[in-house]
Every structure is written in C-alpha cells, then in structure tokens.
C-alpha cells in the first residue's frame, strides 16, 4: 500500500431538494485499471460508509441500485452526487480512493467536504 494525494472541496451546500455534488480528484502515481471510490461520513469519532463503487478506468462508476450516490469519472477525477440528504445529514463527507488493480495497492484519503443541508421551509397554506 502506498499513500496517494486526494483533493476535494472544503464546503458544499446541498440544494433545496437535498442533493449535493462535489469533485474528488486523485493524483494517480501508477497506471491503475481498477479504482474503488468510497464516500465516508465522519461525525464526532464515528465513521460510516455512505456508498462505494468500483470502476474500470474509462468506464462509468457503478453504485449499488439502492445507493444514495451516483457519479461519473473523467481521468483522475470523480464527480460524486449524494441524494436524499436532510438537515440531520449535515457533516463531513470524506472521499477515499483506492487503486485496486494492478498491484501495488494505493490508498488516498481526502480531507473531507463539509456538506450543509437545510431542510426546505414548508409552504404555507393559502386560502384561494
């Protein structure tokens, strides 16, 4: 395993529909053909996996059908979108990139993107 630099934005504001997008960019030290991207949420000292996808270079990311994440890849950049976010999901979202194949294995951990989610105000009832 060798360490690899991963960059991601410091702050992102989710849309009113609870969607947040950010770019995760990694400085690939080798010619990887298979890459694993994981989004982790860190709250206090708890780390949980939000979603993960493995993709072949040049192909699209494939998340599980029930995943709240979608994404596209372009070279050493991954464009990640997280859906269905609510105010309680506000937190630090860390991008982890692993070059899985061929060996050697490389690991990169981003510093995290603070995603702020604000629940939309309910529409007031109107008498018409």
């Amino acid at each position: 395993c060798k360490a690899m630099h991963v960059a991601q934005p410091a702050v992102v504001l989710a849309s009113s529909r609870g969607i947040a997008s950010f770019v995760c960019e990694y400085a690939s030290p080798g010619k990887a053909t298979e890459v694993r991207v994981t989004v982790l949420r860190q709250a206090d000292s708890q780390v949980t996996e939000v979603c993960a996808a493995t993709y072949m270079m040049g192909n699209e990311l494939t998340f599980l059908d029930d995943s709240i994440c979608t994404g596209t890849s372009s070279g050493n950049q991954v464009n990640l979108t997280i859906q269905g976010l609510r105010a309680m999901d506000t937190g630090l979202y860390i991008c982890k990139v692993e070059l899985m194949y061929p060996p050697p294995y490389y690991l990169g951990i981003g510093n995290g993107t603070q995603i702020y989610v604000i629940d939309p105000e309910p529409c007031p009832d109107s008498d018409f």
């Epitope: 395993c1 982890k96 692993e98 899985m100």
Partner: antibody, heavy 119, light 107 residues
Framework: QVQLVESGGGVVQPGRSLRLSCAAS????????MHWVRQAPGKGLEWVAV????????DYADSVKGRITISRDNSKNTLYLQMNSLRAEDTAVYYC????????????WGQGTLVTVSS | DIQMTQSPSSLSASVGDRVTITCRAS??????LAWYQQKPGKVPKLLIY???TLQSGVPSRFSGSGSGTDFTLTISSLQPEDVATYYC?????????FGQGTKLEIK
C-alpha cells in the same frame, strides 16, 4: 456487534504447515481489508499480511513472504492464513484484525490463536 | 522500509500525572499513524487513528498529535487502568510497521 474468532493454532514441528482461520460476524465482511498481526511471547506486535475486499490484492511482511499465504472466502465471512515451512521464530499469538474505514489501522481484533513451532 | 521508533521504552508515573509517549518515523508518513493500548494478557485496542482522531469509546484523557515524522500520544491525567504497553503503527504504505512499544507503569 463486530466479532472475530480465530482458530487452528497449536504445536507444530519445524518445516511443517498449519492453516489458521478467522470467522467474522457483525459487519459487511467484503467491505473491509483484513489483516493478520502476530506477537511472539513477551515481544511486540508485528504486522504479517493484508488482503483487500475481493481477495485479489494481498501484501506480506518480508519475514513471511514465500512461506505464508493469506486468503478469504467472502461467502463464508472467513479469513485464512496458510503457513508453510514453519520456523521456531514463527512462534507467536496470531491475531486476525479488521482494517479501518479510513485506512489500514486495526479497529477490531480477535482474541488470538497461539502457534508454537517446536520439535 | 520505514522504521518506527518509540520513546521511552518504559516509564513510571503517578496517578494524575500528564504522560507523553513519542513515536518517530524514519521518513514522512503524513498523518497515517495509529496508537494502540495493550493491557497485560489482553488483546490490543485502537486508541487513535489519523494521528489525532480518537476512536469511538476511548476516554478523552487520551489525545494524539503530530504529522510527518514526529508524533505524540498524551494521557492528560493518568489513571490506574492505563497501565499497559502502548504501540504506534504507521499505515501510509505496507509494511504496516509498529513501534517497539512503551511499557507504562504506575509509581
């Protein structure tokens, strides 16, 4: 809750083989890198080997390369360590450990299984 | 391979003391460092990862600092149950080497 239970240790003669197993439960086994760490009697901790997710990627300490093979069966949630050409210096407690989500540190450990290589 | 050197190898301190253990890497490892506690006859326990992040459930008297080559584990107020051997471990690249350990005793 996360549980790691090792088995397969015992007394074995130099040059012989042994296979250790680690049964995992309480987490999604295939989502984690898994490791073996050993500790000789009265000594410190020594990392032995790692195997990633689907089992294709592995890494070993120089002290065991060519003699020890790590493998996993994700359908059985089980990690293995095949030890060949055993030497007296392989005598140790062998721990199965789960790698962390943020890197290959070890957030959960099994209770360990003792391997004694002696004639 | 990168070597990890801990100091001191053993130390004795009184209950309530502030205790510091250092770990030095022979090359820079960014913040890819973990600390473990191993009580006599017990399994190692993760205390800190990423040099300074406290593992869930670990008492707040434990803290970690450092980056690059020099790292520190601090116990702000030593308790009797802290008697153990403490290990650092680097995980930036394989092999994931441990320090030789620091044995902590109560005076």
């Amino acid at each position: 809750q996360v549980q790691l239970v090792e088995s397969g240790g015992g007394v074995v003669q130099p040059g012989r083989s042994l296979r250790l197993s680690c049964a995992a439960s309480g987490f999604t086994f295939s989502s984690y890198g898994m490791h073996w760490v050993r500790q000789a009697p009265g000594k410190g901790l020594e990392w032995v080997a790692v195997i990633w997710y689907d089992g294709r990627n592995k890494d070993y300490a120089d002290s065991v390369k060519g003699r020890i093979t790590i493998s996993r069966d994700n359908s059985k949630n089980t990690l293995y360590l095949q030890m060949n050409s055993l030497r007296a210096e392989d005598t140790a407690v062998y721990y199965c450990a789960r790698g962390g989500l943020l890197g290959p540190y070890f957030d959960y450990w099994g209770q360990g299984t003792l391997v004694t290589v002696s004639s | 391979d990168i070597q990890m050197t801990q100091s001191p190898s053993s130390l004795s301190a009184s209950v309530g003391d502030r205790v510091t253990i250092t770990c030095r890497a022979s090359q820079g490892i960014s913040n890819y460092l973990a600390w473990y506690q191993q009580k006599p006859g017990k399994v190692p326990k993760l205390l800190i990862y990423a040099a300074s992040t406290l593992q869930s459930g670990v008492p707040s008297r434990f803290s970690g600092s450092g980056s690059g080559t020099d790292f520190t584990l601090t116990i702000s107020s030593l308790q009797p149950e802290d008697v153990a051997t403490y290990y650092c471990q680097k995980y930036n690249s394989a092999p994931y080497t441990f320090g030789q350990g620091t044995k902590l005793e109560i005076k």
